[in-house]
């Protein structure tokens, strides 16, 4: 098992979480990638995923989540805009690799969103949100559900958790319709 550590981000309501997940370019460039939330005692829940196959630097928006997969850099950029207190939780980037279980990327993100506004005079708190007001084009996509009974994830009690990624087969029959909105910067 690999020690999977957490990185904490403390932000205020209305702000933007902006993280980058590094992956092996040769292995996973075109693989479908996802952003998941992990709740205590539950399976990771997929909130947004890239296309299948993943398109290079093509922004995909699901609600307030924007994913951009940069194949040539081996990098998945995840942004959650207009954060709400209820967005607080543990998140992770994963790469779908059926029939294997999803490959988890380091580190998990412990997001803590608090009420209040911490902008400074002259700061542009909403600058990253304004670009998303362009009338979107909507496409329908499928994000696989992670249904292996062995993958129920306990949120770690401390800052680290032992996480293994066995090569067991998973059942991909249950899928969820996700509305993905390409966003053009």
């Amino acid at each position: 098992a690999t020690k999977l550590t957490e990185e904490k981000y403390e932000l205020k309501e209305g702000q933007t979480l902006d993280v980058k997940c590094d992956y092996t370019l040769e292995k996973f460039a075109s693989s479908q990638k996802a952003w998941q939330i992990i709740r205590d005692g539950e399976m990771p829940k997929t909130l947004a995923c890239t296309e299948r196959p993943s398109k290079n630097s093509h922004p995909v928006q699901v609600g307030r989540i924007i994913l951009e997969d940069y194949h040539d850099h081996g990098l998945l950029r995840v942004r959650m805009v207009n954060l709400q207190v209820e967005d607080s939780g543990l998140y992770q980037c994963v790469i779908y690799q059926p029939p294997k279980e999803p490959h988890m990327l380091f580190d998990r993100i412990r997001l803590v969103v608090t009420k209040g506004f911490s902008g400074t005079p002259g700061s542009n708190e909403n600058s990253t949100q304004n670009v998303y007001k362009i009338p979107p084009t909507t496409t329908k996509a499928l994000c696989p559900l992670y249904t292996s009974p062995r993958t129920v994830t306990q949120a770690p009690p401390k800052s680290t958790a032992d996480v293994s990624t066995p090569d067991s087969e998973i059942n991909l029959t249950n899928v969820t319709d996700i509305i993905r909105v390409p966003v053009f910067n």
């Epitope: 020690k3 932000l11 993280v19 370019l25 040769e26 990253t128």
Partner: antibody, heavy 119, light 108 residues
Framework: EVQLLESGGGLVQPGGSLRLSCAAS????????MSWVRQAPGKGLEWVST????????YYADSVKGRFTISRDNSKNTLDLQMNSLRAEDTAVYYC????????????WGQGTLVTVSS | EIVMTQSPATLSVSPGERATLSCRAS??????LAWYQQKPGQAPRLLIY???TRATGIPDRFSGSGSGTEFTLTISSLQSEDFAVYYC??????????FGQGTKVEIK
């Protein structure tokens, strides 16, 4: 505990070569990008190069592109910087730095190794 | 390339006083900013990342604020061990990742 230990610094003539190494321990080395950051005497910090966890992606500052090569051996938990065609302006303390898992900032640093380029 | 500008270059403060350091980015970087502390003869140490979040083991007298192009590092009550040079760094997306030129906090 994360530990980064640089070696390989020293005095070299302009046009010469040097290879810096960084031995890493205390974390899952192949899961994290690694970087070199330098600091000329009495000056500020300058990012030099970064390599992804798998080694598949490399980045270089314009000032060293074509002369420096970053590499890593994940089986030995080592990071290297091959420096060729060295110039006087490359004189600096070179730090090995671990890149955070979620963004391109540096959450752990080695103590640095001094490279002096002079005739 | 994003240019990071820190001010002032030197800040003279008495122990126990508040210190406010500024960092300005030449273009918006959202919250993609880190602060480092460096003491003479030592390696830099991460203080703050994501503009606000304190790194592990950093005392709560250090706090970060700002977004977009204007950022501030505040040391609420300077201790003797806080006298050092402080650097900001942006990490918006792709390289080069740039540092400010540093602010030296010295004893008044």
């Amino acid at each position: 505990e994360v530990q980064l230990l640089e070696s390989g610094g020293g005095l070299v003539q302009p046009g010469g070569s040097l290879r810096l190494s960084c031995a890493a321990s205390g974390f899952t080395f192949n899961a994290y990008a690694m970087s070199w950051v330098r600091q000329a005497p009495g000056k500020g910090l300058e990012w030099v190069s970064t390599i992804s966890g798998s080694g598949s992606t490399t980045y270089y500052a314009d000032s060293v592109k074509g002369r420096f090569t970053i590499s890593r051996d994940n089986s030995k938990n080592t990071l290297d910087l091959q420096m060729n065609s060295l110039r006087a302006e490359d004189t600096a303390v070179y730090y090995c730095a671990k890149v955070a898992g979620s963004n391109f900032f540096f959450d752990h640093w080695g103590q640095g190794t001094l490279v002096t380029v002079s005739s | 390339e994003i240019v990071m500008t820190q001010s002032p270059a030197t800040l003279s403060v008495s122990p126990g006083e508040r210190a406010t350091l500024s960092c300005r980015a030449s273009q918006s970087i959202n919250h993609n900013l880190a602060w480092y502390q460096q003491k003479p003869g030592q390696a830099p140490r991460l203080l703050i990342y994501g503009a606000y979040t304190r790194a592990t083991g950093i005392p709560d007298r250090f706090s970060g604020s700002g977004s977009g192009t204007e950022f501030t590092l505040t040391i609420s009550s300077l201790q003797s061990e806080d006298f050092a040079v402080y650097y900001c760094q942006e990490f918006i997306l792709f390289p080069p990742w740039t540092f400010g030129q540093g602010t030296k906090v010295e004893i008044k």
